[in-house]
């Protein structure tokens, strides 16, 4: 069998909404993966889990099943979302991402992704992990890759 | 507003021990870490720990286990910093601070410890 | 540990001119990064938070940039009152550390 290669794209999208009185960060974070199969057979995308992480705490997990196949020599774009909440020991990024001095409210995430293929009943897993630039601060939605190659020299309001 | 009120100089002999407190005001305290810097003399900073009040977590540097411990008194919003065994490295101004996203906000006064006999 | 390389260790300026102050990393800390100044017999004092925005109170002549390992702080027009040390610092991961300071003298 010749290799299924899964490329981490990056951020979708990030929407965000808050809970004043809890000073909790929701979080909704869309993700792009290129999985590409470069065998002579299909084969199947049988799960994508998903995790988020902020400052080495898991803000988010996700999990999607029985997804899509891929035709030989096929490749094909996923977009899978992270629900996030950054919250409780971590409340004191909710002064940051509503702070109303500064124009971009970029926090790094963690983005961790496994993939499971499976191809005449052999299944197969493949894990990426990217640290990402995320505006906390308001609806964003990127450009393919942008997110990890954010220029964050943002010029003050 | 915010502020860290930290206590008074301490001349103490080489051995002893010194605690000294942060008190925090302004703000809920459980939200922010405390962090805690020493400065010796005409030298610059190093960072001790941390202490978040939100859960009791406390985070310290290797080259202070063993010299810093860090506590807490939630009904008075004080952190304190606790250093033994004193030698004349010690000797040095210590400060607390308050942790925000990429950097510390809010700076106490610091708190001035002479180790001599 | 990541050890924050900064320069200059001092300078020395006229009022009205620029400086930039620089910090390098030994790996990418991602914009988690202060600039403090610190004046002679006080405590340091908050300029930039992660890499570039401007803490409260702040004048905006001074400013933050960079990302990934390479940091820098510039004071446009240079006031008497900026006189003082200048410290960056990671936020990345424990521990953080400072860099040794940047001492800004007056000329």
């Known amino acids: 069998p010749r290799s299924i290669d899964v490329k981490y794209i990056g951020v979708k999208s990030a929407y965000v909404s808050y809970d004043v009185q809890k000073r909790t960060i929701y979080l909704n974070i869309t993700n792009t993966l290129n999985i590409t199969n470069n065998n002579y057979y299909s084969v199947e995308v049988e799960n994508i889990t998903a995790q988020v992480q902020f400052a080495k705490t898991v803000i988010g997990k996700a999990r999607l099943n029985n997804i899509t196949h891929i035709g030989p020599l096929d490749m094909k774009q996923i977009d899978y979302t992270v629900p996030t909440v950054i919250a409780e020991e971590m409340s004191y990024m909710y002064d940051f991402c509503t702070l109303i001095s500064i124009k971009v409210h970029n926090i790094v995430l963690m983005m961790q992704v496994t993939v499971t293929t499976t191809y005449f009943g052999h299944s197969e897993q493949i894990s990426q992990e990217r640290y990402q630039y995320v505006d906390c601060g308001r609806n964003t939605t990127y450009q393919l890759g942008q997110s990890e190659y954010l220029n964050v020299l943002q010029p003050q309001q | 507003q915010v502020q860290l009120q930290q206590s008074g100089a301490e001349l103490v002999k080489p051995g002893a021990s010194v605690k000294m407190s942060c008190k925090a005001s302004g703000y809920t305290f459980t939200t922010f870490p405390i962090e805690w810097m020493k400065q010796s003399h005409g030298k610059g900073l190093e960072w001790i720990g941390n202490?978040?009040?939100?859960?009791?977590?406390?985070k310290y540097n290797e080259k202070f286990k063993g010299k810093a411990t860090l506590t807490v008194d939630k009904s008075s919003s004080t952190v304190y910093l606790d250093l033994s065994r004193l030698t004349s490295d010690d000797s040095a101004v210590y400060y607390c601070?308050?942790?925000?996203?990429?950097?510390?906000?809010?700076w106490g006064q610091g708190t001035s410890v002479t180790v001599s006999s | 540990d990541i050890q924050m390389t900064q320069s200059p260790a001092s300078l020395s300026v006229s009022v009205g001119e620029t400086v930039t102050i620089t910090c390098r990393a030994s790996?990418?800390?991602?914009?988690?990064l202060g600039w403090y100044q610190q004046k002679q017999g006080e405590s340091p004092q908050l300029l930039v938070f992660?890499?570039?925005n401007l803490a409260d109170g702040v004048p905006s002549r001074f400013s933050g940039s960079g990302s990934g390992t390479q940091y820098s702080l510039k004071i446009n027009s240079l006031q008497s009152e900026d006189f003082g040390t200048y410290y960056c610092?990671?936020?990345?991961?424990?521990?953080?550390?400072f860099g040794g300071g940047t001492r800004l003298e007056i000329k």
């Open positions: 202490f978040h009040p939100y859960n009791d977590d406390t």
């Open positions: 992660a890499a570039t």
């Open positions: 790996e990418n800390i991602y914009s988690s």
């Open positions: 610092q990671h936020l990345w991961s424990i521990p953080w550390t």
């Open positions: 601070a308050r942790y925000f996203y990429g950097g510390m906000d809010y």
